[in-house]
């Protein structure tokens, strides 16, 4: 029998390389059985995750899973960092793994770092 617990499918230590000025959608895949839970996004500041209150979010429904989306329109340099989604379900708080956005400032296309180059810059996290 499949579990009817809410599950948030963000992979552990997932990372995205994105460009400032571009639009970007950060997805939190949510599995639930009956009532859709209340889901929020927060941004990590040290060990504290600060709830993102005034940000555009939306739901995208698919057959077996729903996506709670945080919209970046456009991406700004200070969007760099780690994010987590959380769901309230039957008085329980379920937290996802964090996912990290590495934001590159707008440059000419020839100067843009590749994903490989971005991956070698863990200092961007801090």
């Amino acid at each position: 029998k499949e579990s009817c617990d809410v599950q948030l499918y963000i992979k552990r230590q997932s990372e995205h390389s994105i460009l400032a000025g571009d639009p970007f959608e950060l997805e939190c895949p949510v599995k639930y059985c009956a009532n859709r839970p209340h889901v929020t996004w927060c941004k990590l500041n040290g060990t504290t995750c600060v709830k993102l209150e005034d940000r555009q979010t939306s739901w995208k429904e698919e057959k077996n899973i729903s996506f709670f989306i945080l919209h970046f329109e456009p991406v700004l340099p200070n969007d760099n960092g780690s994010y987590r989604c959380s769901a309230n379900f039957q008085s329980n708080l379920i937290e996802s793994h964090s996912t990290t956005l590495y934001v590159t400032d707008v440059k000419s296309a020839s100067e843009r770092p590749s994903k490989d180059e971005m991956a070698s810059r863990p200092w961007l996290l801090y």
Partner: antibody
Framework: EVQLVQSGAEVKKPGESLKISCKGS????????MYWVRQMPGKGLEWIGR????????RYSPSFQGQVTISADKSISTAYLQLSSLKASDTAMYYC????????????WGQGTLVTVSS | DIVMTQSPDSLAVSLGERATINCKSS???????????LNWLQQKPGQSPKRLIY???KLDSGVPDRFSGSGSGTDFTLTISSVQAEDLAVYYC?????????FGQGTKLEIK
């Protein structure tokens, strides 16, 4: 059952380049991470790097950064390891492996690809 | 990088005896999610490595229960309660907490 099948053994000359493949089955690779490990003859295991097949994001060990390129084609559930400017010291068994990105509930290794670099 | 150090480098154990392999990391493997990403692999001669244990003590599917893992922080142990002939292999610990992932140097288990 999660399985990985790697491309066959290769013999190359110094200075040449090579791309080896690793095809996954039994799992949606977008839900996984795929990684590569080197084992030189008679030696231990060295982590080369990993890729998130969902978005192509890579992480490399500093020891291998700039020497190798990891890529993936999620449409055919395949990861690749490209080795450039091969040297005799690149002679090794190269393993790919895949693990569950959410809970690490599985970790499966390929059969290995033996690369021999010799003039 | 986190350095993983195993001891001993090799050990010879009689069939039915207990084998213990230690693994020490140069820094704590406790992650911010409260989990410790320490794995044990077994590599039999001429074969690919196979994961035996993950998250310090969880056994992979199909792994005999004579294998067990324990430890926390920086000190970890793999125990084989009653060594069988088919356990002849090299055993590796490795950490999945920080990048780059790193392996111990391996411990060769031989049968007396």
């Amino acid at each position: 059952e999660v399985q990985l099948v790697q491309s066959g053994a290769e013999v190359k000359k110094p200075g040449e380049s090579l791309k080896i493949s690793c095809k996954g089955s039994g799992v949606n690779i977008k839900d996984t991470y795929m990684y590569w490990v080197r084992q030189m003859p008679g030696k231990g295991l060295e982590w080369i790097g990993r890729i998130d097949p969902a978005n192509g994001y890579t992480r490399y060990s500093p020891s291998f950064q700039g020497q190798v390129t990891i890529s993936a084609d999620k449409s055919i559930s395949t990861a690749y390891l490209q080795l450039s400017s091969l040297k005799a010291s690149d002679t090794a068994m190269y393993y790919c492996a895949v693990y569950d990105g959410y809970y690490e509930s599985f970790d499966v290794w390929g059969q290995g690809t033996l690369v021999t670099v010799s003039s | 990088d986190i350095v993983m150090t195993q001891s001993p480098d090799s050990l010879a154990v009689s069939l039915g005896e207990r084998a213990t392999i230690n693994c020490k990391s140069s820094q704590s493997l406790l992650d911010s999610d409260g989990k410790t990403y320490l794995n044990w692999l077994q590599q039999k001669p001429g074969q690919s490595p196979k994961r035996l244990i993950y998250l310090v003590s969880k056994l992979d599917s199909g792994v005999p229960d004579r294998f067990s893992g324990s430890g926390s922080g920086t000190d970890f142990t793999l125990t084989i309660s009653s060594v069988q002939a088919e356990d002849l292999a090299v055993y590796y610990c490795w950490q999945g907490t920080l990048f780059p992932r790193t392996f111990g140097q391996g411990t060769k288990l031989e049968i007396k």
